[in-house]
């Protein structure tokens, strides 16, 4: 059988607002007082098994004791009333769980959405945490009819159980209730049709046009509640490799439609499209984006001719020369399609033309010593580019006019080249460049620059601490001008090794030192100067600095009959490197001198 408790705590289910005061009372039963020989002054209050300080306890009468808590902050406290039976044995009388929290805030930001094909979902901001069990109920009604309540599981949203009825306004609000209070949100009044989020458009397809290489035609299927809604669209696109989307102006897609032509695109370029929709009034929510679909614009003829240049091979005969016509593959943005071949037309000054069709990017021809005009066009399946024209003068003609003030300098990890144009109008410039090495030939790469350019950088990721030889040639209508060259480094470093010094001549009081220039492969930069350090085994070290143009130096004021140790270092702008140490001994007597 259940034992009757010796007393009770009131209130039995205490819930307290945080920060407020709270008083509980424990009332002992008469029978209990007699059985244990106690009264209310024997009561010990405990919170979470710890005794409450005496100053918080008041004995009201022989059966009743109260306890008061100020500024309650703990979320949950086990409060027990205990007696000291027979004055010493502590016995539990009754216990309650005291909860603390806040009354619900008025819910705000109530919004509802009708996901197409689903029931209406409403969401709100419940405000601050209550720390108590709080029930949120979504209420909705027409002017004449209430709908079933929606009990929220999470306290921030609820999906109603009924299908929405369109074109009739409903009123929606949220009620929040817990042990400390009850509150309602402001109500919102709307037609569910203005809260629809359509399903994304589907079956998006992209087709190109043979007539126009700058357009792609899109078509798709929209749902719009099975045709109940008129939808407007939002179309975005990007090139296949781009990460940012380009927006079709929304004013162009305002009217309900299931197709659209996107214009001003680049030829022979793959584009990716996506589309979403919303009620044409703009009310409601944008659908999620459709699945992406891609298409490629039709080819157009190449928009410009390739860069075009030539090299004359060393010739053995006198009447003919071997000429290598060379050109660059057009970048995709200018090729506008797949380049099928190149058409080269060679015209001798006084005779008929010869046409060559070439699939590669160079053509070697044997030419007489006459002047020739070469033209080059790139061809794709739509047509040919404009022609690049190059005059190949007779080898007997001396090139006049070159660029002046040619300079090269590194900046932002690029090697820049600049020059002053010649005084005669230029068609274009050709830059040729290669890494100088004593172990390999200077095989040039080249690039073409427009006539308006007088500053550019070498294209491609250049090597550091390698010496580049750069040649700039202006090209005129009559043929190439004179070439100007210089050497430059993208980034210098200290030399890989220092000079190896030797003696050329040793006298009693002087020695002529000689050394070879460091090979260009080991220079790692411009050699600015040398230092020569020399010392005897006991004397202090002497250092002299020598200009980089020298390959010998005379040490003077040396002691006779003395062993000298010599070492040379070479310096670039980025530091120096010592060569090996060398020793020599001065003679005791000068030539012809006797003791």
């Amino acid at each position: 059988q259940l034992l009757e408790p010796c007393g009770y705590i009131y209130p039995e289910f205490p819930v307290v607002q945080r920060g407020s005061n709270f008083t509980a009372i424990c009332v002992l039963k008469e029978a209990c007082l007699q059985h244990y020989y106690v009264n209310a002054s024997y009561i010990v209050w405990k919170t979470n098994h710890a005794a409450v300080p005496r100053e918080q306890v008041t004995v009201i009468n022989r059966t009743t004791s109260s306890v008061t808590f100020t500024d309650v902050v703990l979320p949950s406290v086990q409060l027990t009333c205990n007696i000291l039976s027979f004055g010493q044995i502590e016995q539990n009388v009754y216990g309650v769980t005291m909860l603390s929290g806040f009354p619900p805030d008025k819910p705000t930001n109530l919004t509802c959405i009708v996901n197409e094909g689903k029931n209406m979902l409403c969401q709100w901001d419940p405000g601050r945490e209550t720390y108590l069990e709080t029930n949120y109920t979504l209420k909705s009604e027409w002017a004449t009819e209430k709908f079933p309540d929606c009990q929220s599981k999470h306290g921030t949203s609820c999906m109603v159980s009924y299908m929405p009825t369109y074109y009739v306004n409903i009123e929606v609000w949220v009620e929040a209730e817990n042990a400390l209070g009850k509150v309602s949100s402001e109500s919102i009044n709307f037609d569910p049709v203005d809260k629809v989020k359509p399903t994304p458009p589907y079956n998006l397809s992209v087709t190109n046009s043979e007539e126009l290489s700058s357009i792609l035609k899109l078509s798709w299927v929209s749902s719009g509640l099975g045709g109940l809604l008129d939808l407007k669209s939002d179309i975005q696109y990007r090139t296949k490799d781009a990460s940012t989307w380009i927006q079709v102006p929304l004013e162009d897609t305002m009217s309900p439609r299931t197709s659209f032509t996107v214009q001003d695109l680049k030829p022979f370029t793959e584009y990716v499209f996506r589309i979403r929709s919303i009620k044409d009034s703009g009310k409601g929510y944008w659908s999620d984006w459709s699945e992406e679909a891609s298409g490629t614009t039709y080819e157009d003829r190449p928009s410009r001719p390739p860069s075009f240049w030539y090299k004359t091979n060393p010739s053995h005969g006198q009447e003919y020369r071997s000429v290598r016509l060379i050109w660059k593959a057009l970048p995709l943005s200018e090729a506008n399609g797949k380049i099928l071949d190149y058409e080269v037309i060679l015209t001798q000054s006084k005779s008929v033309s010869q046409t060559y069709t070439v699939t590669g990017t160079e053509l070697t021809v044997n030419l007489t010593n006459d002047r020739y005009v070469a033209s080059l066009a790139a061809r794709n399946k739509v047509g040919k580019s404009a022609a690049a024209v190059l005059t190949i003068p007779s080898p007997h003609v001396t090139a006049a006019y070159s660029v002046v003030n040619l300079k090269a300098f590194p900046k932002d990890n690029l090697l820049w080249v600049e020059w002053t144009p010649p005084p005669k109008p230029v068609s274009k410039y050709i830059l040729e460049w290669c890494v100088l090495s004593e172990n390999a030939p200077c095989v040039e790469d080249w690039q073409q620059e427009d006539a308006t350019v007088n500053r550019t950088h070498l294209r491609g990721r250049l090597l550091e601490s390698k010496c580049y030889q750069i040649t700039v040639t202006p090209v005129f209508a009559t043929g190439p001008g004179g070439s100007e060259s210089l050497k430059a480094y993208l980034k210098q470093a200290a030399p890989a090794r220092g000079p190896t010094v030797r003696t050329k001549k040793v006298g009693k009081n002087e020695a002529v030192l000689a050394w070879d220039q460091i090979p260009v492969d080991d220079q790692n930069g411009f050699i600015r100067n040398y230092s020569i350090s020399y010392r005897t085994s006991v004397g202090k070290e002497m250092v002299v600095h020598v200009d980089s143009s020298h390959t010998e130096y005379t040490l003077s004021s040396l002691s006779s009959d003395t062993l000298y140790m010599v070492r040379m270092a070479a310096y670039t702008d980025e530091g120096g490197k010592d060569g090996p140490e060398f020793t020599f001994t001065t003679p005791k007597f000068a030539q012809g001198e006797i003791e």
């Epitope: 091979n313 593959a329 890494v435 095989v443 491609g460 250049l462 090597l463």
Partner: nanobody
């Protein structure tokens, strides 16, 4: 990003042949001169052969002239080195690289041994 991947190396007897390939991606292959270099065990890098961007001009080290042939297929973005009459001193790791740029492959081992 730029990638150069050599293949075709292996073990061959003196007098034998091998054809090395280098597949290139990430830059406009036909616009740049290319080269083969090699590194024998315990030695520095040695230039072997070069070819112009269009393939019309080729260059060889004296040690391989008449035995090796460099070529390129710009439609396939691939560089080749045909190696005939191989000698033991051709044993090395062979690398393909852009002639004047900081692009180089990981290398392929060629071992000539009886």
């Amino acid at each position: 990003q730029v990638q150069l991947q050599e293949s075709g190396g292996g073990l061959v007897q003196p007098g034998g042949s091998l054809r090395l390939s280098c597949a290139v991606s990430g830059f406009t292959f036909s616009n740049y001169a290319m080269k083969w270099v090699r590194q024998a065990p315990g030695k520095g890098l040695e230039w072997v052969s070069s070819i112009s961007g269009g393939g019309g001009a080729t260059y060889y080290a004296d040690s391989v002239k008449g035995r090796f042939t460099i070529s390129r297929d710009n439609t396939k973005n691939t560089l080749y080195l045909q190696m005939n009459s191989l000698k033991t001193e051709d044993t090395a790791v062979y690398y393909c690289a852009a002639q004047n740029l900081d692009y180089r492959g990981q290398g392929t081992q060629v071992t000539v041994s009886s």
